[in-house]
Interface confidence: low
């Protein structure tokens, strides 16, 4: 889903922004864990009817997939449960929350609270601690990308119920030892670290003990630094096109970016007969502009009922915090010359004509081009 914010009038009074869905949360869970996703309503009030979607398909509740209006639980997760999850308003399909879930062979990570490993009465009168889920503790090395949530678990039991403490690199580990703190869930024998950074790398040891004995397990955490890159545009897209007068044209631009890219469709235009400003930078107008919420976006520009003035050079531009990628392409419009076009009234969506072609507002866009208001121009039919 994309948030459309068409930018025809530059420098207008700022809108009071509506709340936007949070950025995609990256979560890593261990195989066999319960994946639990929570989507609280904005502002804390009730939420409208929602559906949970995985990789674009609605999730069907089952004994393993527990679906609630603000919560999703997938029990006994496996690799197949990895993917892009979103909570959407049922009728409108508005994305309210979205998550990227990865299920690994690791002991576990992510912050679920399934409570299934709470201490249980084993019926044994007395006894030293022991692992209740040793099969979940096989993988000692966990490598996760930075910014993920990590959880280590050491589910155990004993009589009396043992205590659990955590060491990092052999020393006592407390919340004040890391920015962002830690969550210790004693009932689930877990240590949770949100938004891990490279300094979180190291050996983490759980120590489980009661008066009859002590057991420990050490996990090694490696935090993989992302090497974000500027957006990538798929080669060959968009392609030059030739269109007949009055036909509809659609351009595709495939954008890949591991950070949310700002995608724009632009058109080179003339102002007072000039294609460039006084400083030599080309004039462009923004036809469509939005923030893509997905790593891979197939974005489209549709021009309806094209006329000769729709011909010219267009740009697909994607910008993230690393840099900019753009692809130029041409539209040629030919065919029998249409009868003199009528002036379309301004209240007809997508067909605004300006009287005077003076530069109302301009703004430097990345130092490359001048962004001008579409209301200075003969408006391009687009949807």
């Amino acid at each position: 889903e994309s948030l459309g914010t068409e930018q025809r009038v530059v420098g207008r009074a700022a809108e009071v922004p509506g709340p936007e869905p949070g950025q995609q949360e990256q979560l890593v869970f261990g195989s066999g864990d319960a994946v639990e996703l929570s989507c609280p309503p904005p502002g804390g009030g009730p939420m409208g009817p929602t559906v949970w979607v995985k990789d674009g398909t609605g999730l069907v509740p089952s004994e393993r997939v527990l679906v609630g209006p603000q919560r999703l639980q997938v029990l006994n997760a496996s690799h197949e449960d990895s993917g892009a999850y979103s909570c959407r308003q049922r009728l409108t399909q508005r994305v309210l929350c979205h998550f990227s879930v990865r299920v690994t062979d690791a002991p576990s990570s992510g912050d679920d609270e399934d409570g299934e490993d709470e201490a249980e009465d084993t019926g044994v009168d007395t006894g030293a601690p022991y692992w209740t889920r040793p099969e979940r503790m096989d993988k000692k090395l966990l490598a996760v990308p930075a910014a993920n949530t990590v959880r280590f678990r050491c589910p155990a039991a004993g009589n009396p119920t043992p205590s659990i403490s955590w060491l990092k690199n052999g020393r006592e580990f407390r919340g004040e030892h890391r920015i962002g703190g830690i969550k210790l869930r004693h009932q689930q024998w877990s240590l949770v670290m949100e938004s891990v950074v490279p300094s979180d790398r190291g050996n983490y040891t759980c120590v489980v003990e009661n008066k009859f004995g002590s057991i420990r397990q050490t996990y090694t955490l490696d935090v993989l630094e992302r090497s974000p890159h500027r957006p990538i545009l798929q080669a060959g897209l968009p392609a030059n096109q030739t269109a007949v007068l009055g036909s509809d044209v659609e351009f595709h631009c495939k954008v890949y970016s591991d950070a949310q890219p700002h995608i724009q469709w632009l058109k080179h235009v003339e102002v007072n007969g000039s294609k460039v400003g006084p400083d030599g930078t080309p004039y462009v107008t923004v036809l469509k502009s939005w923030i893509s919420e997905s790593v891979e976006a197939d974005v489209r520009l549709r021009l309806a009922n094209v006329s000769e003035r729709d011909g010219g050079e267009y740009l697909c531009r994607a910008t993230n915090f690393i840099g900019v990628a753009e692809k130029a392409f041409w539209l040629s419009v030919h065919g029998p010359r249409a009868a003199e076009e009528e002036l379309v009234e301004a209240d007809e969506a997508g067909s605004v004509y300006a009287g005077e072609q003076k530069l109302i507002s301009e703004e430097d866009l990345g130092g490359e081009q001048k962004l001008i208001s579409e209301e200075d121009l003969h408006h391009h039919h687009h949807h």
């Epitope: 948030l3 914010t5 922004p17 409208g48 508005r94």
Partner: antibody
Framework: EVQLVQSGAEVKKPGESLKISCKGS????????IAWVRQMPGKGLEWMGI????????RYSPSFQGQVTMSADKSIRIAYLQWSSLKASDTAMYYC????????????WGQGTLVTVSS | EIVLTQSPGTLSLSPGERATLSCRAS???????LAWYQQKPGQAPRLLIY???SRATGIPDRFSGSGSGTDFTLTISRLEPEDFAVYYC?????????FGQGTKVEIK
């Protein structure tokens, strides 16, 4: 301040076309759905459908599918409701309303546009 | 579609009295996806309650909503002169969204 301002009253003949408007201000127009609600004289409220101005995505109530067309021009922050051929039974007050952010209830309403269709 | 039936059709009360308005659904309204609106003559409706029981911004606390499943209630604890109006319930849990036919609260 969130405001929805609707176009003025219309008197039309059966068979004529009509387009009424609803202009949003004081909030991010492209980020909230706009609904249209009909109220026939002396009657209750009927939900007609919704449009998302950000990309002009629409959802119609089955009762109104094919009877009306909803559109929006986000550049001028206006949502439209139009008829290609009016009938006497289209005589009603038409309200636009903004849906809350989660897309559920109607949190702000326009003042209404009275449409009268009579020969 | 879910049919909402409001009762009574008209409620005649005096200022200061308590008003209890009922809204019954033909089938369960999931997760209390129900709202209440007030409409005065010549005016647009105004949101009072959403989520069956949450008051909208700026709505006085004499208005309260309750109920779940198929039975919902709007209560006005102490009627003020400006509360005499028509009240509509609306469900948004199932498409198409539907309104009740309204309850008119008039001055006795």
């Amino acid at each position: 301040e969130v405001q929805l301002v609707q176009s003025g009253a219309e008197v039309k003949k059966p068979g004529e076309s009509l387009k009424i408007s609803c202009k949003g201000s004081g909030y991010s127009f492209t980020s909230y759905w706009i609904a249209w609600v009909r109220q026939m004289p002396g009657k209750g409220l009927e939900w007609m459908g919704i449009i998302y101005p950000g990309d002009s995505d629409t959802r119609y109530s089955p009762s109104f599918q094919g009877q009306v067309t909803m559109s929006a021009d986000k550049s001028i922050r206006i949502a439209y409701l139009q008829w290609s051929s009016l009938k006497a039974s289209d005589t009603a007050m038409y309200y636009c309303a903004r849906l809350d952010y989660s897309g559920s209830w109607f949190d702000y309403w326009g003042q209404g546009t009275l449409v009268t269709v009579s020969s | 579609e879910i049919v909402l039936t409001q009762s009574p059709g008209t409620l005649s009360l005096s200022p200061g009295e308590r008003a209890t308005l009922s809204c019954r659904a033909s089938q369960s309204v999931s997760s209390s996806y129900l709202a209440w609106y007030q409409q005065k003559p010549g005016q647009a409706p105004r949101l009072l309650i959403y989520g069956a029981s949450s008051r909208a911004t700026g709505i006085p606390d004499r208005f309260s909503g309750s109920g779940s499943g198929t039975d919902f209630t709007l209560t006005i604890s102490r009627l003020e002169p400006e509360d005499f109006a028509v009240y509509y319930c609306q469900q948004y849990g199932s498409s198409p969204w539907t309104f009740g036919q309204g309850t008119k609260v008039e001055i006795k």
